[in-house]
Interface confidence: medium
């Protein structure tokens, strides 16, 4: 069966903002069957996962930047 | 209070299709996916598959696929399924049931809707 | 598919005594990217539709009494009802939310003696 990490939330708990020199790529999951809310989860530079608040203004200056990098899909 | 009101019980020819519906209450319909699950007479639960009402995304499984048909009208908050070819196989209790994929499960079910597939 | 094994079919048991059930699955239902079991336990009186007792395999849901239990991850699960109650006859379902296709055992049907 397919990986549960491509099918179901991933994010129980998000943060507010993380610092932009701390994250190595983002990924941005759309809502769909498999996940009902939008999830924005940061690799970071140590290799740990975190989950973002997509709403959160820091957050989305975060993905802006990252997408100007192209780090981020 | 959510509520999740299905439409009325069906008796059908063979061959034939049905629709059924499950009109949302309580909550914004399109926050949460609405899956649906068949229940044949007095046998365990079969996942149907599952629509997500704000994008109509859906997700079948393949034993379904090409028997179920998942749609939604977010102006009504209203979920439908229509089965097709129906057979005596079909014959069965169908539920409603919302969740969001986020480890909670499907945490409220509709009351459920016969379906009898008989000539 | 994940196919979902619960024992036993059904159980006779008197108000007041433990009851345990067992739930396995062909597949871990442990998500790897937060460390959670995706393992819910329904319970479903006659004539009514199943009702979400237990998510996160160990997650009372809101409103749910606290005689009820589940534990366990992996694959190996376990629902227990600490004090049985009549009301508490009925048919028990656990189900894997890990992967699709979502599937369901095939039950314990709860008898009171």
């Known amino acids: 069966a397919p990986l549960a990490t491509e099918l179901r939330c991933q994010c129980l708990q998000t943060l507010q903002g993380i610092h932009l020199k701390n994250i190595q790529s983002v990924k941005v999951k759309s809502p769909g069957p498999h996940c009902a809310q939008t999830e924005v989860i940061a690799t970071l530079k140590n290799g740990q996962k975190a989950c973002l608040n997509p709403a959160s203004p820091m957050v989305k200056k975060i993905i802006e930047k990252m997408l100007k990098n192209g780090k981020s899909n | 209070e959510f509520q999740l009101q299905q439409s009325g019980p069906e008796l059908v020819k063979p061959g034939a299709s049905v629709k059924i519906s499950c009109k949302a209450s309580?909550?914004?319909?399109?926050?949460?996916?609405m899956n649906w699950v068949k229940q044949s007479n007095g046998k365990s639960l079969e996942w149907i598959g599952v629509i997500n009402p704000k994008y109509g995304t859906t997700s079948y499984n393949q034993k379904f696929k090409g028997k179920a048909t998942l749609t939604v009208d977010q102006s009504s908050n209203t979920a439908y399924m229509q089965l097709s070819s129906l057979t005596s196989e079909d014959s069965a209790v169908y539920h409603c049931?919302?969740?969001?994929?986020?480890?909670?499960?499907?945490?409220?079910w509709g009351q459920g809707t016969s379906v009898t597939v008989s000539s | 598919d994940i196919v979902m094994t619960q024992s036993p079919s059904s159980l006779s048991v008197s108000a007041g005594e433990k009851v345990t059930m067992s739930c396995k699955s062909s597949q871990s239902l442990l998500n790897s990217g937060n460390q959670k079991n995706y393992l819910a336990w329904y319970q479903q009186k006659p004539g009514q539709p199943p009702k979400l007792l237990i998510y996160?395999?160990?997650t009372r849901k809101s409103g749910v009494p606290d005689r009820f239990t589940g534990s366990g991850s992996g694959t190996d699960f376990t629902l227990t009802i600490s004090s049985v109650q009549a009301e508490d006859l009925a048919v028990y379902y656990c189900?894997?939310?890990?992967?699709?296709?979502?599937?369901f055992g095939g039950g314990t049907k709860l008898e009171i003696k």
């Open positions: 049931a919302r969740g969001m994929g986020l480890l909670f499960g499907m945490d409220y």
């Open positions: 309580g909550y914004s319909f399109t926050d949460y996916n």
């Open positions: 189900q894997n939310d890990h992967s699709f296709p979502c599937t």
């Open positions: 996160g395999a160990s």
